[in-house]
């Protein structure tokens, strides 16, 4: 791997549990300065691979609030606006950390998570497998 | 929102902070145990909007490795094998959040932060905006 | 047309196996994860067994694990349920369908098979 070198400045790690447990500052700096606004808040509906956006919140982990994708159909929509099922709607999967309230219900300690959250949907050319 | 009673076996928050700093466990707890390894992996290709992937490294975040979809193209692939203009491919962007070493070069102390990443792509009709 | 039809269902004893069949037609199951449910009388439908696409990896129900083995045969198109050391609690109606933490459900239940466990 890359190795750092340290800045003279750092907090104190003399923590027994260091490396694994640090300091973070929960006042998030967003960098996305350059974006739409909008995203891709319309996409969902007028994609031929068309999802629903469902809420999951939990209280014990932050952020508490995610927006779970699902795919509307199993087949995509065709040009005519019905459903073809030559076609899969897939889900677009991606693992993204959250932070874990641990013990539960502290306010000031956590611990990383990896879930895996459906972001969209996206049409694919389906897989045959043909009998032997 | 949502009170959450305070667990007496936290950890002590007297840090002057505090709530703005938190400890964080960075030993991952992974809850992906149902999913699926392959998951969108061969997507990417089979999609009629294809993507790319690239590396975004940085060792300055955690994690250091992002992989950002880019689409091959403005259009989508039709039943031909073609590229059809009259469809758009469009990037699938998720906000996520990683940990950003604050100060710089520290191995235990973190800053959350926000960024936007394309995770995939999907194929939409355009808007199409007619002249007065 | 969509439809997934269930089989292998019956009155079986306490301690007995069963194995239930999904046949999936109208589309191509090898994208999909596939999950089996079930609902007993004046109960709501439980997840009980998902095996991702590609039989990548299976996940149970904390109350059927050990017993019961789900599989997927994309071939045939068709999905299954080994169910070992049957309990009168798996007494319901059982029902194949995408997995539906990724997909809207609704549309693909099919009439599901019958499982009755009694002495």
């Known amino acids: 791997g890359i190795t750092i070198p340290r800045n003279p400045g750092c907090p104190n790690s003399e923590d027994k549990n260091f490396p694994r447990t640090v300091m973070v500052n929960l006042n998030i700096h967003n960098r996305n300065t350059n974006t739409n606004p909008k995203r891709s808040s319309d996409y969902y509906n007028r994609s031929t691979s068309p999802w629903n956006l469902h809420r999951n919140e939990d209280p014990e982990r932050y952020p508490s609030v995610i927006w779970e994708a699902k795919c509307r159909h199993l087949g995509c929509i065709n040009a005519d606006g019905n459903v073809d099922y030559h076609m899969n709607s897939v889900p677009i999967q991606q693992e993204i950390l959250v932070l874990r309230r641990e013990p539960p219900h502290c306010p000031n300690s956590f611990r990383l998570e990896k879930i895996l959250v459906s972001v969209g949907c996206t049409c694919v050319t389906p897989i045959v497998h043909h009998v032997a | 929102g949502i009170t959450i009673p305070r667990n007496p076996g936290c950890p002590n928050s007297e840090d002057k902070n505090f709530p703005r700093t938190v400890m964080v466990n960075l030993n991952i707890h992974n809850r992906n145990t149902n999913t699926n390894p392959k998951r969108s992996s061969d997507y990417y290709n089979r999609s009629t909007s294809p993507w790319n992937l690239h590396r975004n490294e940085d060792p300055e975040r955690y994690p250091s490795v992002i992989w950002e979809a880019k689409c091959r193209h403005l259009g989508c692939i039709n039943a031909d094998g073609n590229v059809d203009y009259h469809m758009n491919s469009v990037p699938i962007q998720q906000e996520i959040l990683v940990l950003r070493r604050e100060p710089p070069h520290c191995p235990n102390s973190f800053r959350l932060e926000k960024i936007l990443v394309s995770v995939g792509c999907t194929c939409v009709t355009p808007i199409v905006h007619h002249v007065a | 047309q969509v439809q997934l039809v269930e089989s292998g269902g019956g009155l079986v004893q306490p301690g007995g196996s069963l194995r239930l069949s999904c046949a999936a037609s109208?589309?191509?199951?090898?994208?999909?994860?596939m999950s089996w449910y079930r609902q007993a009388p004046g109960k709501e439908r439980e997840l009980v067994a998902t095996?991702?696409?590609?039989?990548?990896?299976?996940n149970y129900a904390d109350s059927v694990k050990g017993r019961f083995t789900i599989s997927r045969d994309d071939a045939k198109n068709t999905v299954y349920l080994q169910m070992n050391s049957l309990k009168p609690e798996d007494t319901a109606v059982y029902y194949c369908n995408v997995d539906w933490k990724w997909y809207e459900v609704d549309d693909y239940w099919g009439q599901g098979t019958q499982v009755t466990v009694s002495s």
């Open positions: 109208g589309f191509i199951i090898s994208d999909f994860p």
């Open positions: 095996i991702t696409s590609a039989g990548g990896s299976t």
